[in-house]
């Protein structure tokens, strides 16, 4: 007789990352009987929702249901029907919605109301939509990468099961770059966290962690670009903005109303004698870098040391995983290799930004022009943020690991968020019972 496979005793969870530029749906899976073990949850699917971030739907909320349909239907297909009702669905909105809420709490609630109504029509266990704080975003990103790297496991190994592993229990710091904010999170070495807002205390798997985190709102790559444009147009003599952060020959018309739409440009807002201006690229890395540095106020620091804008930052410690847009941008520029020094990265960026726009378009014919045009700025911004913003040096650069996935799961805040909300990270080390570990080799 044929052996019948026993039904898998597994559980699923869904997290939607409602970012400023787009929404992604992640499906996670884990063995039901090992919920409290570290490293057992893994990503089985990522579905990128077609269209912009949810904050862009403020004037067309009736389209939100259709917008979410494809990825929610994909979840319906991937997860067995028998599991639908038990599968929790969480939506976390990040800095794009934080900015909308700053403009109008009612408009933010309007968007989230329709998102919640739309998601509740699916057969899953919908657990609500909320705007997560920058602190949560940083903390959950840190939990995700360390969970996936096996840093919370008390069993020390003589071999490495994942890349980047340094075979010790030192946690990795987390560097997250989005479209509207960026987060830095790590365990400082014997350093007091001087500002309470930046201090987190965790007890995970029987160990205490004192974690530093900060989220810089408006310093995601897209909002940083809007800031830079708003700053530079102030001193332009006419409606032409010669911009070193775009390739030579590149031209784009920008509406002043779009420029001042975001709260991130309020500090640079002024009455201009024109309604539109034209960006003309001149492709100069050094000048672009200098322009970006003007976004970081380093003249004021009420602590022993700061990142920028008067925000406390302890001395950097250990290895860091840089993910989300840090990874996507550097991957596009082919600069994610561990062997590429900071000096080499700078050299490559100089060459890349100086390439004529027509040449770039030909070389990367398959890439949407909107994204393609911004890689020079984004790459330069990443260097500026890491070096001048967070005080990485040419030497400590080698401690930055640009990470897309770990063990098949995307690096980002979503996994940590789900682990927390489903109570799958115990404060204490779970007792090993022969039964629950009977399948271990």
């Amino acid at each position: 007789t044929q052996n019948k496979a026993l039904p898998e005793n597994v559980k699923y969870g869904i997290v939607l990352d409602a970012g400023s530029s787009h929404t992604s749906l992640y499906i996670y899976k884990w063995p039901a009987e090992k919920e409290n073990d570290t490293g057992v949850v893994h990503q089985v699917e990522e579905c990128r929702v077609k269209g912009p971030g949810i904050s862009k739907f403020v004037q067309k909320v009736n389209e939100i249901g259709i917008y979410l349909t494809d990825c929610m239907e994909r979840a319906r297909e991937v997860i067995p029907r028998s599991q639908h009702q038990e599968t929790p669905v969480y939506l976390g909105a990040t800095a794009g919605m934080r900015l909308l809420r700053m403009e109008s709490e009612e408009l933010a609630d309007r968007v989230l109301d329709v998102v919640e109504r739309s998601l509740s029509n699916y057969p899953f266990d919908f657990q609500g939509a909320r705007i997560i704080t920058g602190q949560e975003e940083g903390a959950y990103g840190w939990i995700t990468i360390n969970y996936l790297l096996g840093k919370f496991s008390q069993k020390t190994r003589w071999f490495s099961i994942v890349p980047y592993e340094t075979n010790n229990q030192e946690t990795f710091g987390a560097l997250d770059l989005g479209g509207a904010s960026t987060q830095v999170t790590f365990v400082p070495q014997n350093q007091t966290i001087e500002s309470p807002d930046n201090a987190l205390q965790f007890r995970l798997y029987g160990k205490d962690y004192n974690v530093y985190t900060h989220s810089f709102l408006c310093y995601g790559k897209d909002q940083a670009l809007w800031q830079k444009l708003a700053k530079d147009i102030q001193v332009a003599s006419n409606e032409i903005l010669r911009d070193p952060c775009f390739h030579p020959g590149y031209k784009k018309v920008v509406n002043v109303s779009d420029l001042y739409k975001t709260p991130c440009t309020k500090r640079f807002e002024m009455t201009l004698p024109f309604q539109q201006f034209e960006i003309q690229g001149i492709g100069n890395y050094q000048q672009c870098h200098q322009s970006i540095l003007e976004l970081f106020n380093t003249s004021y620091c009420p602590y022993s040391q700061c990142a920028f804008n008067g925000i406390f930052l302890p001395p950097l410690q250990g290895d860091f995983g840089a993910f989300s847009a840090f990874y996507f941008v550097m991957k596009f520029l082919n600069l994610t290799s561990e062997k590429v020094s900071q000096e080499k990265v700078t050299e490559m960026m100089k060459k890349f930004c100086a390439q004529p726009w027509e040449e770039i378009k030909t070389s990367y014919a398959g890439v949407k022009e909107k994204y393609l045009s911004e890689y020079c700025f984004s790459g330069t911004y990443i260097l500026s943020l890491l070096l001048q913003g967070y005080h990485f040096t040419a030497d400590s650069w080698e401690h930055i690991h640009f990470i897309g996935k770990i063990q098949g799961s995307d690096a980002g805040w979503t996994l940590g968020y789900m682990l927390n909300l489903t109570n799958m990270i115990p404060a204490e080390q779970p007792l090993s019972t022969p039964l629950s570990h009977s399948t271990y080799v």
Partner: antibody
Framework: QVQLVQSGAEVKKPGSSVKVSCKAS????????ISWVRQAPGQGLEWMGS????????NYAQKFQGRVTITADESTSTAYMELSSLRSEDTAVYYC??????????????WGQGTMVTVSS | EIVMTQSPATLSVSPGERATLSCRAS??????LAWYQQKPGQAPRLLIY???TRASGIPARFSGSGSGTEFTLTISSLQSEDFAVYYC?????????FGGGTKVEIK
């Protein structure tokens, strides 16, 4: 002061459909959600679904998915609840209620008088 | 869905006495909880929202407390018009769910 006035009692045959209306007067109709709640004889309250008239977006309890349709007509400030494939267990008083807290605040501040729907062969 | 459980099912109280009704949620609903009063042949009426805020026109003898999963409705001194069925409802998550009700009857 907002008032909700519902259509009259109905007697229906099993397998048929019923459509109950709920007309709002004396306040903003579009922005606030309208929920439908039913109560079987001698039983508690059971939420069926809701709509924001402003956007025409409805959501339903899983139990009623595919059998209930909630719509709204902004021009007449009227919400409708249609329940199909009726069975005897659907005999109940059906209430419409306004979610009076605004977006994401679904407390039911104003109720209609109720519509008795009897399903009997 | 969030399951709401009310206790007791029936409460016998003399007029002028205090009545305490309980409501428990199967998971935290924060303060997104409402209490309703329903008299025979009538539609429910909102008494309390946000766990502790009285709706307009509701007498001060009605008070709500609690947050998270445990909630209480207190009627400080029962009047004859207060004998009715009381329902709690969570409105944090869809579907909106009600407790089974507590009938407050004359002792």
């Amino acid at each position: 002061q907002v008032q909700l006035v519902q259509s009259g009692a109905e007697v229906k045959k099993p397998g048929s459909s019923v459509k109950v209306s709920c007309k709002a007067s004396g306040g903003t109709f579009s922005k606030y959600g309208i929920s439908w709640v039913r109560q079987a004889p001698g039983q508690g309250l059971e939420w069926m679904g809701s709509i924001i008239p402003e956007f025409g977006i409805a959501n339903y309890a899983q139990k009623f998915q595919g059998r209930v349709t909630i719509t709204a007509d902004e021009s007449t400030s009227t919400a409708y609840m249609e329940l199909s494939s009726l069975r005897s267990e659907d005999t109940a008083v059906y209430y419409c209620a306004r979610e009076s807290g605004g977006y994401r605040d679904h407390r039911l501040g104003v109720w209609g008088q109720g519509t008795m729907v009897t399903v009997s062969s | 869905e969030i399951v709401m459980t009310q206790s007791p099912a029936t409460l016998s109280v003399s007029p002028g006495e205090r009545a305490t009704l309980s409501c428990r949620a199967s998971q935290s609903v924060g303060s997104n909880l409402a209490w309703y009063q329903q008299k025979p042949g009538q539609a429910p009426r909102l008494l309390i929202y946000g766990a502790s805020t009285r709706a307009s026109g509701i007498p001060a003898r009605f008070s709500g407390s609690g947050s998270g999963t445990e909630f209480t409705l207190t009627i400080s001194s029962l009047q004859s018009e207060d004998f009715a069925v009381y329902y709690c409802q969570q409105y944090l998550l869809w579907p909106l769910t009600f407790g089974g009700g507590t009938k407050v009857e004359i002792k």
